[in-house]
């Protein structure tokens, strides 16, 4: 049932980095509480000005990132996992995906690899989010599962409703946003359309349903005739600046 799933809506203003792009760049559908430390490739970094990309598996992250819980030693189950910068040569690792391209994990250390070892950045597949069969899900965790999709669909820009990984996969006027069963190309919001404004940073979790951001010259503001409504039901719409 819905109770086991995080279902907060979200307007995704900042878009994730392009497929295979560098990690550690701003842009994502999820905020993590400011000041949280995470272990990147070589040192601890603060998340104050960092908008991490949420993930459930390594393949969803860029080629020089891996998916992990932001705090060292956290199990990750039931908590938000994000894409972290890959580990450089001779750094500690637990699996191949933690190591930067050209390296693989051997005996807990990132080592240089020959071409036969896991060239993840060259794999001709993109990983697209979707909700897995419920018998595959960890009990009650409600987290997305992943499925591969051949990258040929990225040679043409996705139309409304087609699956995507990043907004750059979508045609003009569309953004890439979660829609229950996967991430799909949705229309950027027009004037008067309902938008989502989060009450506070870090409140939106891994969404099941996301709205695009408001189009150019528009802002997501509370609808004037809804000022009297209770806090929980106040309606936000895209309005002229």
């Amino acid at each position: 049932t819905l109770n086991s799933v995080l279902i907060n809506s979200n307007a995704i203003k900042n878009l994730p980095p392009p497929l295979g792009g560098a990690g550690g760049q701003p842009g994502s559908a999820v905020s993590v509480a400011p000041g949280v430390l995470y272990e990147g490739g070589n040192k601890y970094q603060t998340l104050d000005n960092y908008q991490p990309y949420p993930c459930a598996e390594d393949e969803e992250c860029g080629s020089d990132e891996y998916c992990s819980s932001p705090s060292r030693g956290a199990a990750g189950v039931g908590g938000v996992q994000i894409c972290l910068a890959c580990r450089k040569r001779r750094k500690r690792c637990m699996r191949h995906a933690m190591c930067c391209p050209g390296n693989y994990c051997k005996n807990g250390i990132c080592m240089p690899s020959d071409h036969s070892h896991f060239p993840r950045g060259e794999i001709e597949e993109s990983i697209i989010e979707n909700l897995g069969n419920d018998h595959n899900a960890a009990a009650g965790d409600g987290y997305p599962r992943r499925t591969t999709l051949t990258s040929k669909i990225y040679h043409t820009k996705g139309q409304e409703g087609s699956v995507c990984l990043r907004s750059s996969d979508c045609a003009a006027g569309l953004c890439c946003a979660r829609h229950f069963w996967s991430k799909i190309c949705k229309p950027v919001l027009k004037e008067g359309q309902v938008c989502t404004k989060h009450k506070r940073k870090g409140s939106h979790g891994l969404e099941i349903f996301q709205r695009c951001y408001c189009g150019e010259g528009l802002a997501c503001r509370i609808q004037k005739d809804h000022h009297q409504a209770s806090n929980s039901s106040r309606l936000h719409t895209c309005q002229r600046h």
Partner: antibody, heavy 116, light 112 residues
Framework: QVQLVESGGGLVQPGGSLRLSCAAS????????MSWVRQAPGKGLEWVSG????????HYADSVKGRFTISRDNSKNTLYLQMNSLRAEDTAVYYC?????????WGQGTLVTVSS | DIALTQPASVSGSPGQSITISCTGT?????????VSWYQQHPGKAPKLMIH???NRPSGVSNRFSGSKSGNTASLTISGLQAEDEADYYC???????????FGGGTKLTVLG
Amino acid sequence: QVQLVESGGGLVQPGGSLRLSCAASGFTFSSYWMSWVRQAPGKGLEWVSGISYSGSNTHYADSVKGRFTISRDNSKNTLYLQMNSLRAEDTAVYYCARMGIDLDYWGQGTLVTVSS
Amino acid sequence: DIALTQPASVSGSPGQSITISCTGTSSDVGGFNYVSWYQQHPGKAPKLMIHDGSNRPSGVSNRFSGSKSGNTASLTISGLQAEDEADYYCQSWDVSPITAVFGGGTKLTVLG
């Protein structure tokens, strides 16, 4: 333009089997989830099953779980519904629908009649 | 199980406005904040008219509008026309496992 054409419906006895097909055209079939929705004569719509673009994830209504199997062949742009152990209450028009922004395109449907 | 409840029938004269309601349990329309509306003419396939409560797909007349308040979503048709006579279904999603849930449908009759 987007087109979905169902086939394979017909008269079948209770306990029998039937395989429905849905031929898709006018869009990149492998980029969309697909589903089956049915409508019993004079009744409302009932969602039957859904399948991910790659076919690795499938979901079913409780009423058909264990009896119906949804599948797809992306090389043929075709969606399937294998229906086993059919019952009188499965009599309905079966629609295939594209799961884009919700069920955004539907076929015209194929009638399945389960009767002795 | 989640459930969506619609009136069995509504009617109106040409040019009038009518509203069809769809009331859901808190885990679907209210809590989920997402509902779609479909139009179905007799013997035809359903057609998506509204998604995300109030958004019209391209090609749908702006006489059709959607809104939501609390646990009730509404479809309003203004400037009623004879061709609007059809059955209308609201729909929402349960996501674990993924299941589409439809309201029972509302038959719209255009009088005269």
